[in-house]
């Protein structure tokens, strides 16, 4: 979690002098409670916005907006603490709006916004706005919280952000998988404009089951510059295993910007349609049989072969 470095955040508005400060997430009013405290924020809304850094990079940000309740407690409102908690890491980042003048009226509803918390693709957050000073130990809470889900890099607007582009979001491999005779699959995909290697993981499953019955890894060496954006064709040889008919092909690139953590793309070939009256299968027959002398079905050299070429 971090704050956008540009432009400098502003909380001042007509009728209110205010400055934005970094916060330890532990306001002084927790330690030294006050007698009179303001009411809680109203209509807290969190939206996904996008902002450029000074370097021109585009990042997703949490746009936080809330209003004040129209009661007399604004006379005791000294500011607000904004907190963003990344749920999976338990990392928290806070800023404080420090009011440098008193709010005296409700001629119009007071509205506040902040759009400087940078968020990560495909992550979940809890956003809290605390009005300051915070309440006395048994006082009514004067904060409001909302959860916020950031879309992943498949999302159209997210795709062009710097963190997504760094993980390879602009690469569209347009994978096609074709079943050939003799237990083979032809996988075709578009190479990206970088001289980096790729890995194809073939995982096969029995019909209607989620436990794999065959896995095969295939390495594709880095293409030459003249092969960038060309189609690469790979033929994978399947093991002839009973009922092992649903195949998932996953392509993992190793771009320099994301290394082992690049976005992966996959395509699936379904099992062929079953005939209406299938031959009865004895109860005891396994869904697949390992080759004689082999006790498991994980990939090793004799169980799947492949070859590839780049098509210009």
């Amino acid at each position: 979690l971090r704050l956008l470095d540009f432009p400098a955040p502003v909380c001042a508005q007509e009728g209110l002098s205010c400055r934005v400060k970094n916060s330890t997430c532990l306001d002084d009013s927790w330690i030294h409670p006050r007698n009179l405290t303001p009411s809680s924020p109203k209509d807290l809304q969190i939206q996904l916005h996008f902002a450029h850094t000074q370097q021109g990079d585009l990042f997703p940000v949490a746009h936080i907006e809330w209003t004040l309740q129209t009661d007399a407690s604004i006379l005791y409102l000294e500011g607000a603490e904004l907190s963003v908690l990344q749920l999976n890491t338990n990392e928290r980042l806070c800023v404080r709006f420090e009011f440098l003048s008193k709010l005296r009226h409700h001629h119009r509803r007071w509205r506040f916004t902040f759009s400087h918390f940078v968020v990560d693709p495909d992550q979940e957050y809890e956003v809290t706005v605390h009005h300051l000073p915070k309440p006395i130990p048994d006082g009514d809470p004067n904060h409001q919280s909302k959860n916020f889900l950031v879309p992943d890099c498949e999302h159209a607007r997210m795709k062009v952000t710097t963190p997504c582009m760094s993980s390879g979001s602009l690469w569209d491999p347009n994978i096609t998988v074709e079943t050939l005779e003799a237990h083979q699959l032809r996988v075709s995909f578009t190479l990206w404009n970088e001289s980096t290697h790729y890995q194809i993981l073939l995982t096969s499953f029995p019909h209607m089951e989620n436990h794999s019955c065959f896995e095969h890894m295939h390495h594709i060496p880095a293409p030459r510059p003249e092969e960038f954006h060309q189609r690469s064709n790979v033929t994978l040889t399947l093991r002839n295993l009973k009922g092992c008919c649903r195949h998932q092909v996953q392509i993992q690139p190793f771009f320099s910007s994301c290394l082992n953590d690049c976005l992966r793309h996959s395509a699936t070939v379904s099992c062929p349609e079953m005939p209406d009256t299938p031959e009865p299968i004895p109860d005891y027959m396994p869904l697949w049989e390992p080759r004689s002398g082999s006790s498991d079905y994980k990939d090793d050299d004799d169980k799947g072969s492949s070859h590839h070429h780049h098509h210009h």
Epitope: N88, T89, N90, E124, K146, N147
Partner: antibody
């Protein structure tokens, strides 16, 4: 491909404890939290809580507080949910699911039967 | 706690029909709402998140709409495999809560 595989069905006596496991594969385990949801026979879905696979941070449903403990073992990419002082109304299918807010992948479920 | 109410509890429809399921929150949940489909003996399957975004691999006949307190899941042309129970779930605030479900059955 993302998969969550849960441990098998359990039959327990009232007052006993049960520990259900959920083994994750096909993604970086520490990048997402694991949530637990249960479903009593013929009933709807009930959120039990979640655990961060990264930090171990937890958030439990109020009604289960004190009876439930969620843990993870990052070395085996496995999440665990332990429920103590079992009662007959804890009889349910217990599901693990990936993420903390929106559950995009689910385990197959573990039936826990509490009966004397 | 935010209470999610689904209606109707049961819906009897014929294949090919357009189906509209309703979910109402006891207070605003913005667009922080998901829909799940569950068939007997199976885990729930995610259909929609953020009120209107289809989950990966979900056919275009499923669509979600609404924000605030009122939400709708629409199946434009019901297929035989769509007969199931549908649940909505809010993730706007803790505790996360589900609706009671709507069972879509064959007429």
């Amino acid at each position: 491909q993302v998969q969550l595989v849960q441990s098998g069905a359990e039959v327990k006596k009232p007052g006993a404890s049960v520990k259900v496991s959920c083994k994750a594969s096909g993604y970086t385990f520490t990048r997402y939290g694991i949530s637990w949801v249960r479903q009593a026979p013929g009933q709807g879905l009930e959120w039990m809580g979640w655990i961060s696979a990264y930090s171990g941070n937890t958030n439990y449903a109020q009604k289960l507080q004190g009876r439930v403990t969620m843990t993870t073992d990052t070395s085996t990419s496995t999440a665990y949910m332990e429920l103590r002082s079992l009662r007959s109304d804890d009889t349910a299918v217990y599901y693990c699911a990936r993420r903390q807010l929106y559950f995009d992948y689910w385990g197959q479920g573990t039936l826990v039967t509490v009966s004397s | 706690e935010i209470v999610m109410t689904q209606s109707p509890a049961t819906l009897s429809v014929s294949p090919g029909e357009r189906v509209t399921l309703s979910c109402r929150a006891s207070q605003s949940v913005s667009s922080n709402l998901a829909w799940f489909q569950q068939k007997p003996g199976q885990a729930p399957r995610p259909l929609i998140y953020d009120a209107s975004t289809r989950a990966a691999g979900i056919p275009a006949r499923f669509s979600g709409s609404g924000s605030g307190t009122d939400f709708t899941l629409t199946i434009s042309s019901l297929q035989s495999e769509d007969f199931a129970v549908y649940y909505c779930q809010q993730y706007d605030n803790w505790p996360l809560t589900f609706g009671g479900g709507t069972k879509v059955e064959i007429k």
